[in-house]
Interface confidence: medium
């Protein structure tokens, strides 16, 4: 705590200037007026403080809102921003999409810090939905964002803000988040053209069931293996190898350099070995001609 | 190991065609795709399109769409690139390789369009 | 005409580690698998890496590729002298139904 002592005659801060620089701490505490400070924030990021002389600003602005920090002198915190804790940020109500860009523009190039997850936090739920202007401002910042989302908070995601996902926001998301994407972007993109659609979708189809993909290989889309390697194992093993062959295209004969990983693995294993043998490709570990497939699944359901 | 050998340089006038080969050794032909890659004097490569032999269907950039015709023979494992109305500006060295990444290349084919 | 941008030259000492950035679009490099070729002059090209980051058997892992988004970048370190060339990334473009080049990027060894 830094001690209460009387400012020194002629050292009153009139304004927020360069010349705090030279003052020592307790010179801040007892000179610089909280309120004054309040009202010139935007100024304290142009003035190049040290670590401690921040921690005594911080402090003053404590004390000036033990409730929490207003809108108008959060906006134009600046470094200060990385003084506080995600206990501070708490109590703050953050509803200007201007405000959050700025407190993230100070963090950028950095991991999210427990902070900067506090406050979009905050900032979400203040809005009740993560909006296309929240998304296309989180993902610009933080490309992983969506992917660090629950399947639950996903749900909350408008289709209208799929429009603001990249391919690369997608890169870190698991299935089970793309189950709650997929059907939001297959609405989305519904009245686009088919390859403007395929474009679109493509990002999301590691969602897609298995009826979706037989429509696809309808379509001559031509899904590149890299696509197709993140599709769910469950939705691609009942494609027939035909229905493999079209939705591939020429891309097919990469099966062959991805026969040891799933689904590819997996698809294989439940295929015709003659079947896989039209392809060309050496594929091997088909079901042996003459062999009777029982679905179990079937089986089950009806006993 | 995978060989492919194309057909010899050609001088061509502007307003012809011209018809190159690929012919294919080593592997299997049919079920692996033959893509078509030029590359004029000086310049990058530029991809004109694919046919995958036992589909029978090619598909074009759409830049060479209506003036390149891709076709092949699998009884001889020979794929062909036949370009129309010639200007000097497809002077340039006409390649043929294998599979969706290029993995096989021919040796390339010089084709010269002047007047 | 060219979909994927490469910057035009890159150079490195010999030893030095140098990379070839990539960029692409949503609708070829972002889902999609990306390719590097490596190009000696007067030669056909030659397949350095194929989907992002696998290398052919004979190449040394000198040569190293990776993906970010809609971006792939070929790295090369002990830089050999051998190693000056032209390199060009390849990915495919589901928009066009195409396999799309960069405009290559000539590598010097100083």
């Known amino acids: 705590e830094v001690e209460k002592t009387a400012c020194p005659s002629g050292k009153k801060a009139r304004e927020i200037d360069e010349s705090l620089i030279f003052y020592k701490k307790w010179e801040l505490e007892a000179c610089v007026d909280a309120a004054l400070l309040a009202t010139q924030m935007d100024r304290v990021n142009a003035i190049p403080f040290t670590y401690e002389q921040l921690d005594v600003l911080k402090h003053k602005l404590d004390e000036l809102y033990p409730q929490g920090y207003p809108e108008s002198v959060i906006q134009h915190l600046g470094y200060l921003f990385l003084k506080m804790s995600p206990e501070d940020i708490r109590k703050w109500n953050v509803t200007s999409l201007e405000t959050l860009k700025a407190l993230l523009e100070v963090n950028k190039g950095h991991e999210m810090s427990p902070q900067v997850a506090t406050l979009i936090d905050r900032f979400v739920k203040g809005r009740g939905q993560l909006d296309k202007d929240t998304l296309d401002t989180l993902t610009a910042f933080y490309p992983g964002y969506l992917c660090s989302l629950s399947p639950e908070e996903l749900s909350s995601v408008p289709p209208s803000s799929i429009w603001a996902v990249r391919p690369q926001d997608l890169d870190t998301c698991d299935p089970r988040q793309l189950d709650v994407l997929y059907p939001k972007a297959r609405l989305a993109f519904q009245n686009m053209n088919g390859s403007e659609y395929f474009v679109k979708i493509q990002s999301f189809l590691g969602g897609a069931p298995t009826e979706d993909l037989k429509a696809l290989s309808q379509q001559n889309v031509s899904m590149d293996l890299a696509t197709f390697m993140k599709l769910r194992t469950d939705a691609v093993l009942p494609l027939t190898v035909a229905e493999v062959q079209k939705l591939l295209g020429p891309h097919v004969e990469g099966l062959k350099a991805e026969e040891r990983h799933r689904p590819v693995r997996d698809w294989i294993l439940r295929q015709r070995q003659d079947d896989l043998d039209t392809l060309g490709l050496g594929l091997q570990g088909g079901i042996p001609n003459g062999y009777l497939v029982l679905d179990l699944s079937m089986q089950e359901a009806l006993s | 190991q995978v060989q492919l050998v194309q057909s010899g340089a050609e001088v061509k006038k502007p307003g012809s065609s011209v018809k190159v080969s690929c012919k294919a050794s080593?592997?299997?032909?049919?079920?692996?795709?033959i893509s078509w890659v030029r590359q004029a004097p000086g310049q990058g490569l530029e991809w004109m399109g694919r046919i995958i032999p036992n589909f029978g269907t090619a598909n074009y950039a759409q830049k060479f769409q209506g003036r390149v015709t891709i076709t092949a023979d699998e009884s001889t494992s020979t794929a062909y690139m036949e370009l129309s109305s010639l200007r000097s500006e497809d002077t340039a060295v006409y390649y043929c390789?294998?599979?969706?990444?290029?993995?096989?290349w021919g040796q390339g084919t010089l084709v010269t369009v002047s007047s | 005409d060219i979909v994927l941008t490469q910057p035009p030259s890159v150079s490195g000492a010999p030893g030095q580690r140098v990379t070839i950035s990539c960029s692409g679009s949503?609708?070829?490099?972002?889902?999609?698998?990306v390719s590097w070729y490596q190009q000696l002059p007067g030669t056909a090209p030659k397949l350095l890496i194929h989907g992002n980051a696998n290398r052919p058997s004979g190449v040394p892992d000198r040569f190293s590729g990776s993906k970010s988004g809609t971006s792939a970048s070929l790295a090369i370190t002990g830089l050999q002298s051998e190693d000056e060339a032209d390199y060009y990334c390849q990915s495919y473009d589901f928009f066009t139904n195409s396999s799309v080049f960069g405009g290559g990027t000539k590598l010097t060894v100083l």
């Open positions: 949503s609708s070829n490099i972002g889902p999609n698998y």
């Open positions: 080593g592997g299997t032909f049919s079920n692996y795709s």
């Open positions: 390789a294998r599979g969706i990444y290029f993995a096989f």
